[in-house]
């Protein structure tokens, strides 16, 4: 039985040209994490393994960092990268869990709005 | 003056499928999500899912995956969203209302259509 | 998915009251930046529904300023310092920091 739960940073609205950190975590339960994968929509952005670390997809590696911990950077951020992004943890032995993280990003100059963005 | 204009009432058939269409104007189109909302009974809403369609990017409420396909087509300023194998259970009123850039809020809405499923 | 709660489920009104309408959520609404993407929507009989309140206390466009919004976390709150006709309707907190964006049950501000 899949006990897990998900808990990720939420939403983001960020600024074009910036970066944001996409973060999950999973509690309560003591399956062993084997790798997680992030993707967005469906494309693979990167995964990391628990015995081979990290991959970076070739398209992405520019943009993309690994970390901090099972997160992912994302940087100099386009308005193109606006989408959902997908944390799946793969486990044993519970299976699959998957967090869902929404990004939205921004023309700089809506930020005369009043929108806090966050721009690490 | 930003307007959301959506297409009339339907009466449909259980196990029928439907679309829904959503014409914007008045702002940049592309720039803004688009999302649709659900409400039963004449009270409870429900978030079904969003498009952006800059880059056609969607998110769904994992409860409408099957049911509900979200599209758009830039050069008219449409989205629509599509309801799939109707039930009596779909009966409702469905919005479209477009994204408050920086605050995932609701910030204008359509009229709303009627949606009816009924043999 | 986050349980949006609101209460009272009905709130019986005179004109000139000040009221409070709280939404609870099940998990906190702060994103790992610090903002928090909770609104209220008013939804009047025969309209569609509008926005009120954004990002917990910004009032949108048009909005009068007897409305009014706080809170933090998992306790948010809107309040109406002077009851008017127009205010009657259908009240609804939303979310949209966690996917699924997900509604309160809505709240009944009626007439005494």
């Known amino acids: 039985m899949m006990t897990g739960t998900i808990e990720t940073t939420g939403n983001i609205s960020a600024e074009k040209g910036g970066s944001i950190i996409l973060q999950c975590h999973l509690s309560s339960t003591t399956a062993q994490v084997t790798q997680v994968n992030w993707e967005q929509q469906d494309q693979l952005l990167a995964i990391c393994n628990a015995d081979l670390g990290w991959h970076i997809s070739p398209s992405f590696k520019d943009r993309v960092a690994p970390g901090p911990g099972l997160g992912l950077t994302l940087q100099s951020l386009t308005v193109n990268d606006t989408g959902e992004y997908f944390c799946i943890y793969h486990t044993y032995p519970d299976g699959t869990y998957t967090g869902r993280i929404f990004l939205e990003v921004l023309e700089s100059s809506v930020a005369e709005h009043g929108a806090r963005f966050q721009i690490p | 003056e930003v307007q959301l204009q959506q297409s009339g009432p339907e009466m449909v058939k259980p196990g029928a499928s439907m679309k829904i269409s959503c014409k914007a104007s008045?702002?940049?189109?592309?720039?803004?999500?688009m999302n649709w909302v659900k409400q039963s009974h004449g009270k409870n809403l429900e978030w079904l899912g969003l498009?952006?369609?800059?880059?056609?990017?969607?998110s769904y409420n994992q409860k409408f995956t099957g049911k509900a396909t979200i599209t758009v087509d830039k050069s008219s300023n449409t989205t629509y969203m599509e309801l799939l194998s109707l039930t009596s259970e779909d009966s409702a009123v469905y919005y479209c209302?477009?994204?408050?850039?920086?605050?995932?809020?609701?910030?204008?809405w359509g009229q709303g259509t009627s949606v009816t499923v009924s043999s | 998915d986050v349980v949006m709660t609101q209460t009272p489920l009905s709130l019986p009104v005179s004109f000139g009251d000040q009221v409070s309408i709280s939404c609870r959520s099940s998990?906190?609404?702060?994103?790992?930046?610090?903002?928090?993407?909770l609104s209220w929507y008013l939804h009047k009989p025969g309209q569609s529904p509008h926005l009120l309140i954004y990002?917990?206390?910004n009032r949108f466009s048009g909005v009068p300023d007897r409305f009014s919004g706080s809170g933090s976390g998992t306790d948010f709150t809107l309040k109406i310092s002077t009851i008017k006709p127009e205010d009657l309707g259908m009240y609804y907190c939303?979310?949209?920091?966690?996917?699924?964006?997900?509604f309160g049950g809505g709240t009944k501000l009626e007439i005494r």
């Open positions: 498009i952006f369609p800059y880059n056609s990017a969607t």
């Open positions: 939303l979310q949209g920091t966690h996917q699924p964006w997900t």
């Open positions: 998990q906190s609404l702060a994103n790992s930046y610090g903002n928090t993407y």
């Open positions: 990002g917990i206390s």
């Open positions: 209302a477009r994204g408050l850039r920086g605050f995932f809020a609701l910030d204008y």
């Open positions: 008045g702002y940049s189109f592309t720039g803004y999500t």
